[in-house]
């Protein structure tokens, strides 16, 4: 029985010119690997992996693939035309057969140069505009919540005076600075009983919210 | 095309050694391996081992450590194999051949060298 | 190391036949597996290479089948040039080792 899995770098991408790492690893099982083929889009071969004879490499790229590291392949002086999909195909004892397959985008030296250059601001920029939507969705909750305490205690003066004057618990706790809410849906505590417009409004800013926060900030429930 | 010139016999005595040589022609020397195979009179073929001209890396089959030593010269695109300590066993034909495009198979061989052993 | 057995180890056919030779390794070698044609007082000369490729010299009544322990080449319509020693050769371990040989002769 086959249990192993071949886990591989997946889609890269690189810059014309440039050189990129084949990687393929099998993991999952204790069958021993004999050879290692590595093929490109057409299934031409590239080079082949051999336990017991080394390395084959395809004559025609000799000057440009490099064997390994390890059972990887490295692509080196990188085309246009190295555009596409790399197989490798594990040969292991007793197990049989594996495939792994990469996608491999070869960019124009000045896209790769371009998409270098701004990847680090655009992080920055997104990262700022995750600690702005958290600091945002603080602001509502407290506001929220000051809007209807407020709302609360004028009500509760008011029956205050008709009443013995008990007092209703409403839990309150603000989300800590730096942090997001996980919310499945707008926490009960803004909402509360109501059913209108604006807290359905909110509902769907929440859930919205808690998609594109998942991941990338502590999270912090609160139950209502 | 490809071509790959072995010279005539040779008659050795036991206890020296032999040089032999493969010059390649016709395609790129440094892509692909260089085999060596043995095969003594009537019977069938023996792996001794290849190397890769491109890094000077070679392969021998266990069998042949110690008897055969292969080199390469990237300047005259010939290959060598040296044999040591020759016995009336080592008599036999050798032949250089070419490795295949996609695997460590023969693709194109050459005429082969007769080796005879005799004091 | 990887066996290779041979069958049969001569035979005897006329011009005009098909003929299959065998070839048997000891364990699972996939499809890495050569065929060699060699004429009396020649050099051995490639035929098929990785079970079922022939290389572009090669006339295609020259055909070869088979993976994993069970290999064969069959010639359809003899011709009298193919007439000589066959050998298999497997390309999958160290060290890599050859069929004792087939002897094709004209009947």
């Known amino acids: 029985m086959m249990t192993g899995t071949i886990e591989t770098t997946g889609n890269i991408s690189a810059k014309k010119g440039g050189s990129v790492i084949l990687q393929c690893h099998l993991s999952s099982t204790m069958a021993q690997v004999t050879q290692v083929n590595w093929e490109q889009h057409d299934h031409s071969l590239l080079a082949i992996r051999n336990a017991e004879l080394g390395w084959h490499i395809y004559p025609a790229f000799k000057d440009r693939v490099a064997p390994g590291p390890g059972l990887g392949l490295t692509l080196q002086s990188l085309t246009m035309n190295d555009t596409g999909e790399y197989f490798c195909t594990y040969h292991t004892y007793p197990d049989g057969t594996y495939r792994g397959r990469i996608f491999l985008e070869v960019l124009e030296s000045s896209v790769a140069e371009h998409s270098a250059r701004f990847q680090i601001p655009l992080l920055g920029a997104m990262a700022m505009m995750l600690v702005v939507i958290c600091i945002a969705v603080i602001v509502v909750v407290v506001l929220a919540r000051k809007k209807k305490s407020l709302r609360i205690h004028s009500v509760e003066s008011g029956l205050q005076r008709k009443s013995t004057g008990q007092e209703e618990q409403i839990p309150s706790a603000p989300s800590p600075p730096g942090s997001c809410v996980q919310a499945e849906a707008a926490p009960a505590g803004l909402c509360g009983e109501q059913q209108g417009d604006d807290c359905a409004e909110l509902h769907d800013y929440f859930n919205v919210l808690s998609y594109r926060s998942l991941g990338s900030c502590s999270f912090f429930t609160e139950t209502g | 095309q490809v071509q790959l010139q072995q010279p005539g016999p040779e008659l050795v005595k036991p206890g020296t050694s032999v040089m032999l040589s493969c010059k390649a022609s016709?395609?790129?020397?440094?892509?692909?391996?260089m085999y060596w195979v043995k095969q003594s009179h009537g019977k069938s073929l023996e792996w001794i081992a290849f190397i890769d001209p491109y890094n000077g890396g070679s392969t021998y089959n266990q069998r042949f450590r110690g008897k055969a030593t292969l080199t390469v010269d990237k300047s005259s695109s010939t290959a060598y194999m040296h044999l040591n300590t020759l016995t009336s066993d080592d008599s036999a034909v050798y032949y250089c051949?070419?490795?295949?495009?996609?695997?460590?198979?023969?693709?194109?061989w050459g005429a082969g060298t007769t080796v005879t052993v005799s004091s | 190391d990887i066996q290779m057995t041979q069958s049969p180890a001569s035979l005897s056919a006329s011009v005009g036949e098909t003929v299959t030779i065998t070839c048997r390794p000891s364990?699972?070698?996939?499809?890495?597996l050569s065929w060699y044609q060699q004429k009396r007082g020649k050099s051995p000369q490639l035929l098929v290479y990785n079970a079922k490729t022939l290389p572009e010299n090669v006339p295609s009544r020259f055909s070869g089948s088979g993976s994993g322990t069970q290999f064969s080449l069959k010639i359809d319509s003899l011709q009298p040039e193919d007439f000589g020693n066959y050998y298999c050769q497997h390309h999958y371990g160290n060290p890599l080792t050859f069929g004792a040989g087939t002897k094709l002769e004209l009947k």
């Open positions: 364990e699972n070698i996939y499809t890495y």
């Open positions: 016709g395609y790129a020397f440094s892509r692909y391996s």
């Open positions: 051949a070419r490795g295949g495009d996609y695997g460590w198979y023969l693709g194109v």
